[in-house]
């Protein structure tokens, strides 16, 4: 055996954003023939020796970072990329608005603003159909998400969440959807 065993993949189905009391399944997938898996919840000292963790009803205590590995012979694989399992609906939903408005001409500018009555310092913006939130450092975790030089690809349904950096895996309920329409 030369070099470390390749890392497995870890995914949350149907999504890593899980409303409280809703089900989610974490699945660790390594190469064919591997059956010894360890799934860890980081910063909690806990682990289980199974590739699949079924959570029938999401709880606050289950939110956090997860990672998995597998053992082949006496060798351990590299760890999977960390999966951030987020509990949503912990706090009331924020409001999402578009400035100057939700209808914008192609080539124009628009800013999506996420507002909450709580003193949260973190915000995430999701576009329906995208696998992940906007993670561009300039737009990530901000109350304002400017979209410069709008194109047709920006059309769609947006939602935002708010949360605190002290509890980064406990999020609000999603805002009501905002439909961004790109004309021309």
């Amino acid at each position: 055996q030369s070099g470390p065993l390749p890392k497995p993949s870890l995914q949350a189905l149907p999504s890593s954003l899980v409303p409280l009391e809703k089900p989610v399944t974490l699945r660790c997938q390594g190469p064919p023939g591997v059956d010894l898996y360890r799934l860890e919840k980081l910063s909690s000292s806990r682990y289980q020796d199974q590739a699949v963790l079924f959570i029938p009803a999401m709880k606050r205590s289950l939110a956090g970072r997860y990672r998995c590995s597998y053992q082949n012979g006496s060798l351990w694989s590299l760890p999977s990329d960390q999966l951030e399992l987020v509990a949503t609906g912990v706090f009331a939903k924020p409001s999402l608005s578009a400035q100057p408005g939700p209808a914008v001409s192609s080539g124009g500018d628009v800013t999506l603003q996420c507002q909450t009555r709580y003193g949260f310092d973190q915000f995430a913006l999701y576009k329906e159909g995208d696998p992940a939130p906007y993670k561009n450092p300039e737009r990530w975790y901000r109350a304002s998400f400017p979209i410069i030089t709008v194109t047709a690809a920006h059309s769609g349904t947006y939602r935002c969440y708010s949360f605190s950096s002290r509890d980064p895996y406990l999020w609000s309920a999603p805002s009501d959807p905002l439909e961004l329409v790109v004309t021309g």
Partner: antibody
Framework: QVQLVESGGGLVKPGGSLRLSCAAS????????MSWIRQAPGKGLEWVSS????????DYAASVKGRFTISRDNAKNSLYLQMNSLRAEDTAVYYC????????????????WGQGTLVTVSS | QSVLTQPPSVSGAPGQRVTISCTGS?????????VHWYQQLPGTAPKLLIY???NRPSGVPDRFSGSKSGTSASLAITGLQAEDEADYYC???????????FGGGTKLTVLG
Amino acid sequence: QVQLVESGGGLVKPGGSLRLSCAASGFSFSDHYMSWIRQAPGKGLEWVSSVGSEGKFIDYAASVKGRFTISRDNAKNSLYLQMNSLRAEDTAVYYCARHYREFRWHYYYFDYWGQGTLVTVSS
Amino acid sequence: QSVLTQPPSVSGAPGQRVTISCTGSSSNIGAGYDVHWYQQLPGTAPKLLIYGNSNRPSGVPDRFSGSKSGTSASLAITGLQAEDEADYYCQSHDLGAHVWVFGGGTKLTVLG
């Protein structure tokens, strides 16, 4: 109450073998990871080996890999450590320790320890 | 050479506060693994003192507290008592080969 009792220690010559046992009682043995941890005279603690609750996951410290073999018999509530090719530096008190468990989760710490059994490797 | 680094000894007078540090690396404490502390009184087996960085098992006085930050952790003992004289060990897990790791131990001496 939880009890872990080690046995099998003694004096052995370098290159010799010894088998340690740990008898567990007062808890559901088959639910818990178990480990062997040793302490050389006047020195600190060194983790030696661990075995998963079903005996599948097995890990060793680099210092004993290939010489020591951990095993368990859940029907007998017993943990074992077969030590071969013993060296002077293996001289230590060997502790059997239980890993904490809660519901489906195992934890990376030891909530109960036995009193230990002394292994002396000397010619 | 232990994977986790602790001072060999600390001391304090009765009633005082002492702290014991435990320094690891990005593959253990810094990799998201918690730190646990054990107390070993002279001639006895180690006993779990703090688990999950800062939690006390039942029966452990609240004079003992733990914390973790980045790749290090510390154990604090306030209102030092003669019976606290013991060896203290930190422990974590290491991601490299999934091994359990200990600090070298710290001998606490209660003066006077």
